[in-house]
Interface confidence: low
Amino acid sequence: ALDAAYCFRNVQDNCCLRPLYIDFKRDLGWKWIHEPKGYNANFCAGACPYLWSSDTQHSRVLSLYNTINPEASASPCCVSQDLEPLTILYYIGKTPKIEQLSNMIVKSCKCS
Amino acid sequence: ALDAAYCFRNVQDNCCLRPLYIDFKRDLGWKWIHEPKGYNANFCAGACPYLWSSDTQHSRVLSLYNTINPEASASPCCVSQDLEPLTILYYIGKTPKIEQLSNMIVKSCKCS
């Protein structure tokens, strides 16, 4: 799996999970989240050569097409596969609210 | 939806469905498929600016992050959303076989 266990241990130019810390205020301009101040969102990036973690038959076809026609702009892309929620604390007036924001943290990637 | 009805009628630089015809023999080197000789596979391509058909909360976060930090390589990518199968005819010896290859045709796209 193209997850932290594999990607963070290996230097990998192909599609893989990349570390990314997001500071809510600085990076997103969000001032409404009280805790946490930021989180390890991670992201997916890298090339998608033929058969590198292809998600569907179409992405396998596309990567093979791209191998034979390298000038074509039609190629698979490295995107998130498994995502996890993030629990946040914010306030409505003086009332604290705890909420779980779904699909906030990328855990693994795929070529799609 | 970023499908043919929208994308093929509009000149759209952002993430959208793009037409792509694939000839099995010429483009993939596949000689085993008897019929069809090729098919309209389509593909997804284009920029994913903030809130352009974002698939998940993470992709919305990433596109907002990319707006504020446009030099960062962390950005959502335009990938397939809905896919359809393709029915093919091939031979094992002299015996014709009809099979449905799943997820071969892209019908719509998303920013993920």
Epitope: D13, A45, C78 | D13, C48, P49, P70, E71, S73
Partner: antibody, heavy 122, light 112 residues
Framework: QSLEESGGRLVTPGTPLTLTCTVS????????VNWVRQAPGKGLEWIGY?????SAYYASWANGRFTISKTSATVDLKITSPTTEDTATYFC???????????????????WGPGTLVTVSS | AAVLTQTPSPVSAAVGGTVSISCQSS????????LSWFQQKPGQPPKLLIY???TLTSGVPSRFKGSGSGTQFTLTISDVQCDDAATYYC????????????FGGGTEVVVK
């Protein structure tokens, strides 16, 4: 995929000048384009860029002295009030596509235009 | 604003020999690897050799090698050829400041 600068010429100090970078083979709504200059016999100097989304960013020394804007196929660099120190060859360069995401850069500028020479003299 | 300091010019190298050029940044580059190396010959625009600190651009000979992370980077040219005579620049990408990019002062390589 190529870029070409135009508009470089001899101008007198204080006369505004607009340089144009014409692109072909790619869309400006998918790529960020930078302006870089090089004074005669000197090194490269990053001026600023306009992102695929249309936001312009400038080096702190260039803020107020330059304005970057774009149309569907061109990126303009306006030198608001040229001085003799602005004499240089001006290049436009695209962020290279890294992996599958066209907005990625990793400080990789490729391709570049051939450059256009601006001479500021009284 | 970040300052990139390169090995003083000129650096002399013999054909077949090895030359190393250092590039030191006054602050960490983005993601510790937003560092590129360019080659420039008189009358020509710069040519991208290496990006992401160590990734070789397509078509660039493997004699060119980039290394380093954070604030300290090195370009090594092994088996130096006459055609390698040029000025080499490093460029760094930065987050959070208005100065998103900066170039080093350049290092001239003279081949004997």
């Amino acid at each position: 995929q190529s870029l070409e600068e135009s508009g470089g010429r001899l101008v007198t100090p204080g006369t505004p000048l607009t340089l144009t970078c014409t692109v072909s083979g790619f869309s400006l709504s998918s790529y960020t384009v930078n302006w870089v200059r090089q004074a005669p016999g000197k090194g490269l100097e990053w001026i600023g860029y306009i992102s695929y989304g249309g936001s312009a960013y400038y080096a702190s020394w260039a803020n107020g002295r330059f304005t970057i804007s774009k149309t569907s196929a061109t990126v303009d660099l306006k030198i608001t009030s040229p001085t003799t120190e602005d004499t240089a060859t001006y290049f436009c360069a695209r962020h290279m596509q890294v992996g599958g995401a066209p907005t990625g850069s990793m400080a990789a500028f490729d391709p570049w235009g051939p450059g256009t020479l601006v001479t500021v003299s009284s | 604003a970040a300052v990139l300091t390169q090995t003083p010019s000129p650096v002399s190298a013999a054909v077949g020999g090895t030359v190393s050029i250092s590039c030191q940044s006054s602050q960490s580059v983005y993601n510790n690897n937003y560092l590129s190396w360019f080659q420039q010959k008189p009358g020509q625009p710069p040519k991208l050799l290496i990006y992401g600190a160590s990734t070789l651009t397509s078509g660039v000979p493997s004699r060119f090698k980039g290394s380093g992370s954070g604030t300290q980077f090195t370009l090594t040219i092994s088996d130096v050829q006459c055609d390698d005579a040029a000025t080499y620049y490093c460029a760094g990408g930065y987050s959070g400041s208005s100065d998103k990019y900066a170039f080093g002062g350049g290092t001239e390589v003279v081949v004997k």
